[in-house]
C-alpha cells in the first residue's frame, strides 16, 4: 500500500433494481480489478421532491475523479442522477451533495442511507 492512500477492497452494495438485474439487494461487494489499478466505491441516487432514492452503490474502477477522496460527495449542480465516488473501504456508506457553484448553504445535508 502507498502511504497516505486508502486502498479500497470492499464497498457497500445496493441495487434498487435487484430483481430485474438478478442481484442481491444489499450487502458488501468485494472490489476486483487489475492489480496495479486503483479501486473506488460509488453511490448513485435521485432526489424525488426532497426524498432521497438510492439507485445503486458498489465498486468503481480506477478513476482520477475519485483519487484521494475519502468522502463520497456529488458536486455537480442538480444532476438528473447524483453520483459520487471515493477511496477507502465502505466509504460509500454515507454520501452528500455540495454543489460547487452554490454560495449559500447546500440544498441537502449529508445522507446516511437506509435501504428499504
Amino acid at each position: 500500500a502507498i502511504l497516505g492512500r486508502s486502498e479500497t477492497q470492499e464497498c457497500l452494495f445496493f441495487n434498487a433494481n435487484w430483481e430485474r438485474d438478478r442481484t442481491n439487494q444489499t450487502g458488501v461487494e468485494p472490489c476486483y480489478g487489475d492489480k496495479d489499478k486503483r479501486r473506488h466505491c460509488f453511490a448513485t441516487w435521485k432526489n424525488i421532491s426532497g426524498s432521497i432514492e438510492i439507485v445503486k452503490q458498489g465498486c468503481w474502477l480506477d478513476d482520477i475523479n475519485c483519487y484521494d477522496r475519502t468522502d463520497c460527495i456529488e458536486k455537480k449542480d442538480s444532476p438528473e442522477v447524483y453520483f459520487c465516488c471515493c477511496e477507502g473501504n465502505m466509504c460509500n456508506e454515507k454520501f452528500s451533495y455540495f454543489p460547487e457553484m452554490e454560495v449559500t448553504q447546500p440544498t441537502s445535508n449529508p445522507v446516511t442511507p437506509k435501504p428499504p
Epitope: D34, F42, T44, K56, G58, L61, D63, N65, K76, E80
Partner: antibody, heavy 115, light 111 residues
C-alpha cells in the same frame, strides 16, 4: 475476460442517423465509463464522448454536441452511440472503450455514409 | 481541448531504442498525470500500453516505458522488435470532469 462486442457494419445515406451498440461482458458494467472514439479511413483517433454507465451522465466533445447521443441499458450491459444528420465525412470506424483509461476496446463498427 | 502534438513518424532498427513525444499544454499534459499511450496495428483496435504517464498496462512488455517532462509526455520502446511496428497514439483520461483528447498518431517503422 473483459469483452466489448459491437454491432455490425452500417451503410447510411447523408442526413440519416446511425445507432451503434457495445455489449460488455466479463466485468460489472455499472462500475465505470464507456467512451466512444472514431477513426476515419487513414486518419487518427478522435474522442467523441463518454457515458457514466451507472448514472447515465454524459460528456460530449464540442465537435459532436447536438449531433451525438450516448445512452446505455444496464439490464443488458449495453452502451449505445447515436449520431444524427450524417455526412460523408462521418464515414469511419467507431469504437467503444471501457473506463477513463480506455483499457479494453470493442472490435470497431464501420459506418459508411454514401449517397 | 486541442489535440496533442506527436511526430508523424519515427523509425529504428531492431534492438535500438526509440522515443515518441506527445506535447500538450500546462493545463493538460503539464498539470496532471493522466496521459496514456496506445498501440494500433493495421485493421485492429487500439491497445492500451501505458496509462497515467508511466504505469505499464497488465501484460505489456517492460520494453515499453512512459515519462513526462513539463508539457511533454514520452513513450520509449527499447530493444525494438519487428512486431512493434504500428501506429502509436497518446491520449488523456476521459470521464467525469475530464474530456478526452488524442494526439495525431505516430507511425513507427522498424527498419
Amino acid at each position: 475476460q473483459v469483452q466489448l462486442v459491437q454491432s455490425g457494419a452500417e451503410v447510411k445515406k447523408p442526413g440519416a442517423s446511425v445507432k451503434v451498440s457495445c455489449k460488455a461482458s466479463g466485468y460489472t458494467f455499472t462500475s465505470s465509463y464507456i467512451n466512444w472514439v472514431r477513426q476515419a479511413p487513414g486518419q487518427g483517433l478522435e474522442w467523441m464522448g463518454t457515458i457514466n454507465a451507472v448514472s447515465g451522465s454524459t460528456s460530449y466533445a464540442q465537435k459532436f454536441q447536438g449531433r451525438v447521443t450516448m445512452t446505455r441499458d444496464t439490464s443488458i450491459s449495453t452502451a449505445y452511440m447515436e449520431l444524427s444528420r450524417l455526412r460523408s465525412d462521418d464515414t469511419a470506424v467507431y469504437y467503444c472503450a471501457r473506463g477513463g483509461w480506455f483499457d479494453y476496446w470493442g472490435q470497431g463498427t464501420l459506418v459508411t455514409v454514401s449517397s | 481541448q486541442s489535440a496533442l502534438t506527436q511526430p508523424a513518424s519515427v523509425s529504428g532498427s531492431p534492438g535500438q531504442s526509440i522515443t515518441i513525444s506527445c506535447t500538450g499544454t500546462s493545463s493538460d499534459v503539464g498539470s496532471r498525470n493522466y496521459v496514456n499511450w496506445y498501440q494500433q496495428h493495421p485493421g485492429k483496435a487500439p491497445k492500451l500500453m501505458i496509462y497515467g504517464v508511466s504505469k505499464r498496462e497488465s501484460g505489456v512488455s517492460n520494453r515499453f516505458s512512459g515519462s513526462k517532462s513539463g508539457n511533454t509526455a514520452s513513450l520509449t520502446i527499447s530493444g525494438l522488435q519487428a512486431e512493434d511496428e504500428a501506429d502509436y497514439y497518446c491520449g488523456t483520461f476521459a470521464g467525469g470532469d475530464y474530456y478526452g483528447v488524442f494526439g495525431g498518431g505516430t507511425k513507427l517503422t522498424v527498419l
